[in-house]
């Protein structure tokens, strides 16, 4: 009975102690996009710088081919920013055959591929009409909640429009996760 | 070995076990801020309540003269948001020359200060144009992301324009870190 | 002594250990929200999804009537999306009077209740002017932030105006707390 | 409804601090900044700096840096200013204003209090 | 150092409509909460007329209306009255936070 008095009487043997310090963690940073084709009605999705600068993978996180890739099953927080730049969107110029026009906008969505499960599960999606008058524009948009994974789950960013993101500094547009 | 059973083999010796109860955290939320000259092409950085209201500053971590000081080197989540105001910005009045004008706009910044190191280095940015026809505006900006920090950095909130900080309300504009 | 060594001196007794993966988390995602009578001056609450889906509230964080009831006492990370959309809102129209139309707008706030306290205490508020020309518009607001909160207190979200919620996705309206 | 009720008119010498007080009523005092301004004799407005009753935070004007002090009493409701190192130019009405949060406009005001300043 | 630059007087007579400007000499003037204008009647205490250039708080005529165009603000009471003598102030806020004053503009009413 000994050791007993260093583990609580509410964390049973289910529920083993883990140190903080080696949890799955990532923090990946925005790199310039290289072309590349995707299908008219799919959203890009978006690489990542994952070890220079601000950038780290951690505790068997990894990141390849435009995905992290969950190590192990558990509670995640999972968070993203992209910064959209553009021209002005003139739909200022409202009535065309008497209605308005659809807007323009700018989207991102952070996705969940499951190997076994065909289709991936968006997760996170913010999305804004872009509808700026006489200037060229600039936003970010934000996102961040916590997810249930399973090990071997993949996270990706999905964007609607890859030539409108902001990728010249590592503090605009970033991709995270970590387990909680 | 008597101990070791509430020790899982995955705990190693070179990551001990805490207590998340003791972990450095903050939460700082918006005062009034006061006249001070700034220079025109630096960013002046936010001070903040650390006690009152819905503010605190726990184990270790504490607010001095507008930076939180990084009691302990680990990763961290860090986070903000600023709310800004302001009069109409006349960019609707929008050729000028021809050509559309530079937009008014609204930025923050988190930014580390680690004094071994002569640059600051800015962590997170969420910068938005600023063209709002007709109306008075308000709008926040929010960031945060994890970050690997070191014991004694320094981080600061920076904003493009104070004069437009609305800092009536502690759940308008705040800013916080906390050791994962 | 023997089972010291597992034990480092900085977690002393005041702090026991606990296992992460019994830690209260909850994350709710939106439904469509019925009608509901709510008072002039006051934000109306969500109701929301706590099972199907994306969403789920474990280790004894319950969802009951619009409130996620906190179970135990100690440090919470929270946070929300909202995504609004609606039609134009004319404030381009914006001489009556020879002065600018006072702006629609859009809001969330987290907020808490306490039992024991008479009035509901905002922990984040996100607040939008929206004057879009010539579209209908969609945007989200998002909020994250940690407070110390209390067993037995409860959070919701309001909205300034519960008929521009996008119910419509799972992963554009959401909202969720977790013990740190 | 909202009142500022300030002190009785003082006179000093130079060298001396004045400590001039405005009282509060009508209103949650704790909620709404208050600002102090004067106006010397047939010239215009000086602000001179605001005060949080609440926290007891307070940004002052750069020309009356070291020199002012605004205080406030939450049980009493009432504001203070004092001003150090008092000069001949410091002959002025000072007045307190409750200020409105989203506008930073001064919405109501003091009846003001004549400070003189004379050897 | 900004400066907020009125005239010094104006006049008008009683019914006629008179305009009082309020220049800047910096476009970050007035950028967070916009320009607020004051009346003081002789021997009193500054009462607020106009607040974020165009609102008028209750109890204030709508012969008082204020506007903005550029770096300026303006002040116009139409239907002049004998008891709207007195000075007015703009007042502002500038981009270290310091509360501006206009240097005041006397209004005389004619006859």
């Known amino acids: 009975l000994k050791g007993q008095e260093f583990a609580p009487s509410h964390q049973q043997v289910y529920a083993p102690l883990r140190a903080d310090g080696d949890k799955p963690r990532a923090h990946l940073t925005v790199v310039r996009q290289t072309p590349t084709q995707h299908f008219k009605n799919q959203f890009p999705a978006l690489h990542w710088e994952h070890e220079l600068g601000l950038a780290f993978t951690k505790n068997r996180m990894n990141y390849t081919n435009k995905f992290l890739l969950i190590p192990e099953s558990g509670d995640y927080f999972i968070y993203s920013q992209v910064t959209f730049r553009g021209m002005t969107s003139e739909c200022s110029e409202i009535r065309q055959a008497g209605r308005p026009n659809k807007p323009d906008s700018i989207t991102v969505v952070i996705t969940k591929v499951t190997d076994s499960y065909p289709e991936p599960t968006q997760l996170l999606m913010g999305t804004k009409s872009v509808c700026e008058v006489g200037s060229n524009w600039f936003q970010p948009i934000y996102l961040g909640a916590m997810f249930s994974l399973q090990e071997g789950d993949k996270l990706m960013v999905n964007v609607s429009d890859i030539s409108l993101v902001d990728y010249t500094k590592e503090d605009k547009t970033f991709f995270g996760a970590f387990l909680l | 070995l008597k101990g070791q059973e509430f020790a899982p083999s995955h705990q190693q010796v070179y990551a001990p076990l805490r207590a998340d109860g003791d972990k450095p955290r903050a939460h700082l939320t918006v005062v009034r801020q006061t006249p001070t000259q700034h220079f025109k092409n630096q960013f002046p950085a936010l001070h903040w309540e650390h006690e009152l209201g819905l503010a605190f500053t726990k184990n270790r971590m504490n607010y001095t003269n507008k930076f939180l000081l990084i009691p302990e080197s680990g990763d961290y989540f860090i986070y903000s948001q600023v709310t800004f105001r302001g009069m109409t910005s006349e960019c609707s009045e929008i050729r000028q020359a021809g050509r559309p004008n530079k937009p008014d706009s609204i930025t923050v910044v988190i930014t580390k200060v680690t004094d071994s190191y002569p640059e600051p280095t800015q962590l997170l940015m969420g910068t938005k144009s600023v063209c709002e026809v007709g109306s008075n505006w308000f709008q926040p900006i929010y960031l945060g992301a994890m970050f690997s920090l070191q014991e004694g950095d320094k981080l600061m909130v920076n904003v493009s324009d104070i004069s437009l900080v609305d800092y009536t309300k502690e759940d308008k504009t705040f800013f916080g870190a906390f050791l994962l | 002594l023997k089972g010291q060594e597992f034990a480092p001196s900085h977690q002393q007794v005041y702090a026991p250990l606990r296992a992460d993966g019994d830690k209260p988390r909850a994350h709710l995602t939106v439904v469509r929200q019925t009608p509901t009578q709510h008072f002039k001056n006051q934000f109306p609450a969500l109701h929301w999804e706590h099972e199907l889906g994306l969403a789920f509230t474990k280790n004894r964080m319950n969802y009951t009537n619009k409130f996620l009831l906190i179970p135990e006492s100690g440090d919470y990370f929270i946070y929300s999306q909202v995504t609004f959309r609606g039609m134009t809102s004319e404030c381009s129209e914006i001489r009556q009077a020879g002065r600018p139309n006072k702006p629609d707008s859009i809001t969330v706030v987290i907020t808490k209740v306490t039992d024991s306290y008479p009035e509901p205490t905002q922990l984040l508020m996100g607040t939008k002017s929206v004057c879009e020309v010539g579209s209908n518009w969609f945007q989200p607001i998002y909020l994250g932030a940690m407070f110390s909160l209390q067993e037995g207190d409860k959070l919701m979200v309001n909205v300034s105006d519960i008929s521009l919620v996008d119910y419509t996705k799972e992963d554009k309206t959401f909202f969720g707390a977790f013990l740190l | 409804q909202v009142q500022l009720v300030q002190s009785g008119a003082e006179v000093k010498k130079p060298g001396a601090s004045v400590k001039v007080s405005c009282k509060a009523s009508?209103?949650?005092?704790?909620?709404?900044?208050i600002n102090w301004v004067r106006q010397a004799p047939g010239q215009g407005l000086e602000w001179m700096g605001w005060?949080?009753?609440?926290?007891?935070?307070?940004g002052y004007a750069q020309k009356f840096q070291g020199r002012v002090t605004m205080t406030a009493d939450r049980s009493t409701s009432t504001a203070y200013m004092e001003l150090s190192s008092l000069r001949s130019e410091d002959t002025a009405v000072y007045y307190c204003?409750?200020?409105?949060?989203?506008?930073?406009?001064?919405?109501?005001w003091g009846q003001g209090t004549l400070v003189t300043v004379s050897s | 150092q900004s400066v907020l630059t009125q005239p010094p007087s104006v006049s008008g007579a009683p019914g006629q409509r008179v305009t009082i400007s309020c220049t800047s000499s910096?476009?970050?003037?007035?950028?967070?909460?916009?320009v607020h204008w004051y009346q003081q009647l002789p021997g009193t205490a500054p009462k607020l007329l106009i607040e974020?250039?165009?609102n008028r708080p209750s109890g204030v005529p709508d012969r008082f209306s204020g506007s903005k165009s550029g770096t300026s603000a303006s002040l116009t009471i139409t239907g002049l009255l004998p008891e709207d003598e007195g000075d007015y102030y703009c007042?502002?806020?500038?981009?270290?936070?310091?509360?501006?004053f206009g240097g005041g503009t006397k209004l005389t009413v004619l006859g």
């Open positions: 204003a409750r200020e409105v949060p989203e506008t930073a406009a001064f919405e109501y």
């Open positions: 009508g209103y949650t005092f704790t909620s709404y900044d």
């Open positions: 005060l949080n009753p609440n926290s007891g935070n307070t």
């Open positions: 910096s476009s970050d003037i007035g950028a967070g909460q916009g």
């Open positions: 974020g250039y165009y």
């Open positions: 007042q502002s806020w500038d981009g270290t936070l310091s509360a501006l």
